[in-house]
């Protein structure tokens, strides 16, 4: 059977696959997924290995019309480096010479300057080019190679291995060489895979059942360290509770060098955040950190300095800590908007079982603002999801020049932020450079400010506007209000009406359903429309909602189903990637972010049309 990294190299014009008959004869044959001689896989960013021979595709020279055969894999050889050129061409790196079918006289696969159909190759059984099944480096653990990546294939006791092996071991632990010749270089590490005993790579906190992996012998950049954790279904460490910090201080007490954790300020427009999306609510900075020097966007825990945190340049090479298992966050169920009949007093706005009100004109210090909210039967607002934040920004009349108190503060326990209404902290969205918690100005309270409504810590004695929130009072069945300019069941936002399509549909079916309603699959023009849509669908239990974006028409170029320019994007991490498809909005922890899915997957969707009686603004000129 093919493992997910392996593929057959298919030429559509001849309907045949590449076949490594011998190291000196790489030809074609009728495709057969069971034939080892037809299986290939990427073993580095640019090398393709024959699974049967554990040798790499290469050429004797970078010249036109030479035979492509198999060679001992050598990551330094210029003659084994391949790259995908536009669409389905595979070429030798840096040259306009392509992997070619050969001809009637020449049975072997050839290197050729022509880029016609005989030089076009796909992964058999798909429409994808060979690079879509690209190489993913596997970072090792322990061993003696400082966490370097596996080098496949590698030689051990004169035998070649294209995968992790337990050779030389009686306990089944899987390892790999980190250079192609273990016998000479003696460099290796254990593979980040599941095998009997691999749980001893982790330390489990008996109190929380969360597991931690301390990789003190590794030397990786922050991004490499994160990748290594993710390869083990884990993430770089986040610390949200004082107990967790105490446990880790003990776990790392015998070490001296810094270890990467998940804290970073890599997001262009927001502040400090954990890579696993935990809220940044507990601070344990080393005195003098975080330093404001540009580029110091990643954070290490310093065992030698009482496990306090320091921001560094992300390209530094350090050890790292991974975390997996139950999150340390208290479970806190946020009701979906649709589940809760929400009735609010006049001037309060309903959302997901609560009522909200902005007090902009009567400026108050935080303590007095809190008193006022409590007198009104509520509290300073807590915010538990991106959807709730986006509701406040897009539907509560929030303005970009606002600076408003919210309920977050660290008055009770310094450097440990809590909501004034006592609900757990499950979400934070700090402004760039925040929380700064400048010690010379006790910044114990938190405001929402700026166009995105992100947060900053602030001295509590400033008179500012504030946002109150209270539980709504349920009064029997909810009255469905018909919004002006929109049909029943549609929701109005600015000039448009929106409706959730409740039948699970493919992209094409969803598009047709919207068209039948004299509407179209939603476009998203800017941050504010995105905020509205996130609050509209984000709390719903379904995982995805189709938007009108896809690259069906031109692979690699995403377009809306209606003739409108793509002026705003909100991609999830690793998106859009190389895969063609249709774009859906995520819900849950990644609420509102865009993922590329196969267009024939089934999801719910959002339709959109102009509200009646609205004058269309002129199209922006470019």
């Amino acid at each position: 059977l093919l493992d997910t990294r392996q593929f057959l190299i298919y030429n559509e014009d001849h309907k045949r696959c590449v076949d490594a008959v011998s190291p000196s004869a790489v030809q074609t044959a009728a495709c057969n997924q069971d034939a080892e001689s037809q299986k290939f896989r990427w073993v580095s960013e640019s090398q393709i290995m024959s699974v049967a021979f554990k040798l790499c595709l290469g050429v004797p020279s970078k010249t036109d019309w030479v035979a492509i055969t198999l060679y001992a894999c050598d990551s330094k050889s210029e003659f084994q480096k391949w790259e995908c050129k536009n669409d389905t061409l595979l070429g030798i790196k840096g040259e306009d010479l392509f992997f070619n079918y050969g001809n009637r006289q020449e049975k072997n696969i050839m290197l050729y300057k022509g880029s016609g159909l005989w030089s076009r190759w796909k992964i058999y059984g798909t429409t994808d080019n060979l690079c879509s099944r690209g190489y993913e480096a596997m970072y090792t653990l322990l061993g003696n190679a400082n966490g370097a990546t596996c080098a496949f294939p590698f030689k051990f006791e004169n035998k070649w291995y294209a995968d992790c092996t337990s050779a030389g071991r009686s306990d089944g632990w899987l390892w790999c060489g980190t250079t192609t010749d273990y016998d000479t270089d003696k460099l290796f590490g254990y593979c980040p895979l599941k095998f009997e005993g691999s749980e001893s790579l982790w330390n489990k906190d008996p109190l929380t059942s969360v597991s931690y992996q301390i990789n003190s012998k590794s030397a990786l950049t922050w991004h490499q360290a994160r990748k290594s954790c993710q390869q083990q279904n884990a993430e770089l460490l986040s610390i949200t509770e004082i107990h967790e910090q105490t446990y880790l201080t003990g776990l790392t007490s015998s070490l001296t060098s810094g270890l990467w954790i998940g804290l970073n300020s890599l997001s262009f427009n927001s502040g400090w955040q954990w890579s696993d999306r935990s809220p940044f609510r507990y601070l344990n900075w080393l005195p003098g950190s975080p330093s404001a020097e540009p580029g110091k966007s990643c954070v290490s825990l310093n065992p030698g300095k009482n496990a306090k945190w320091e921001n560094l340049e992300c390209v530094q090479k350090l050890g790292y800590i991974c975390k997996k298992g139950n999150t340390t966050l208290n479970s806190f169920v946020i009701p979906s908007e649709s589940d809760v009949p929400t009735h609010c007093p006049s001037q309060w706005w309903p959302y997901a079982g609560h009522c909200y009100k902005i007090h902009r004109d009567e400026k108050k210090i935080q303590r007095d603002a809190l008193t006022t909210c409590r007198k009104e039967g509520g509290d300073l607002t807590s915010i538990h999801t991106i959807e709730e934040l986006d509701f406040i920004i897009s539907q509560l009349g929030y303005e970009p020049n606002d600076e408003l108190w919210i309920g977050l503060n660290d008055i009770k326990i310094q450097m440990y932020f809590e909501w004034s209404d006592g609900t757990p902290v499950t979400f934070t969205k700090w402004l760039r450079g925040e929380p700064s918690h400048e010690n010379n100005r006790q910044e114990d309270c938190v405001v929402m400010k700026g166009k995105d409504g992100y947060w900053a810590d602030r001295g509590c004695e400033w008179p500012l506007g504030y946002i109150c929130k209270m539980k709504s009072r349920s009064q029997g069945p909810e009255i469905v209000e018909v919004e002006k300019g929109c049909r029943k069941g549609w929701k109005k936002h600015h000039f448009y009406c929106y409706m959730i399509g409740h039948t699970l549909s493919t992209f094409a079916e969803a598009n047709q359903t919207c068209n039948n309603e004299n509407a179209y699959l939603t476009t998203i023009e800017d941050r504010y429309e995105q905020a509205f849509l996130t609050s509209f669908v984000g709390l719903r239990p379904e995982k995805y909602f189709w938007t009108g974006l896809s690259d069906i028409q031109t692979k690699g170029t995403f377009q809306w189903t209606i003739e409108e320019e793509v002026r705003f994007t909100h991609w999830n991490s690793d998106m859009p990637g190389r895969k063609p498809g249709c774009v859906a909005m995520r819900t849950g922890i990644a609420g509102g972010l865009w993922d590329v899915l196969k267009c024939d997957e089934k999801a719910k969707f959002v339709c959109k049309h102009w509200a009646e009686g609205v004058t269309h603004p002129p199209k922006p000129t470019t």
Epitope: L142, N144, F156, G168, R169, S170, D171, Y182, K186, Y190
Partner: nanobody, 119 residues
Framework: DVQLVESGGGLVQPGGSLRLSCAAS????????MGWYRQAPGKQREEVAA???????NYADSVKGRFTIPRDNARNTVYLQMNSLNPEGADVYSC?????????????WGQGPLVTVYS
């Protein structure tokens, strides 16, 4: 490198008892298992008893009920408590540790103390 230091071998009467110990040291991340093997002159080496890091034990049929294999995790040490010894002559008992260390090879062997049962 991993070193195994064994001790406790000697002469013992039939029916008597003896306790062997084996301590592992060196650049060890974890010990997945430790065990005792014996080899009589002119015979194949056979496993007597083994214990995994999780505490699972395994005994050869010939020693069940007479031998035990306690382990001290903190000291990376395993013992072999031998009771009701049979007059089987002079056997060499060797200790083996299955370790995760700085080479991919897992098995480290000790030199083996001699146990002689005389009648």
């Amino acid at each position: 490198d991993v070193q195994l230091v064994e001790s406790g071998g000697g002469l013992v009467q039939p029916g008597g008892s003896l306790r062997l110990s084996c301590a592992a040291s060196g650049s060890i991340f974890t010990i997945n298992a430790m065990g005792w093997y014996r080899q009589a002159p002119g015979k194949q080496r056979e496993e007597v008893a083994a214990i995994t890091s999780g505490g699972r034990t395994n005994y050869a049929d010939s020693v069940k009920g007479r031998f035990t294999i306690p382990r001290d995790n903190a000291r990376n040490t395993v013992y072999l408590q031998m009771n009701s010894l049979n007059p089987e002559g002079a056997d060499v008992y060797s200790c083996k540790a299955v370790v995760v260390t700085t080479t991919p090879y897992s098995d480290s062997w000790g030199q083996g103390p001699l146990v002689t049962v005389y009648s």
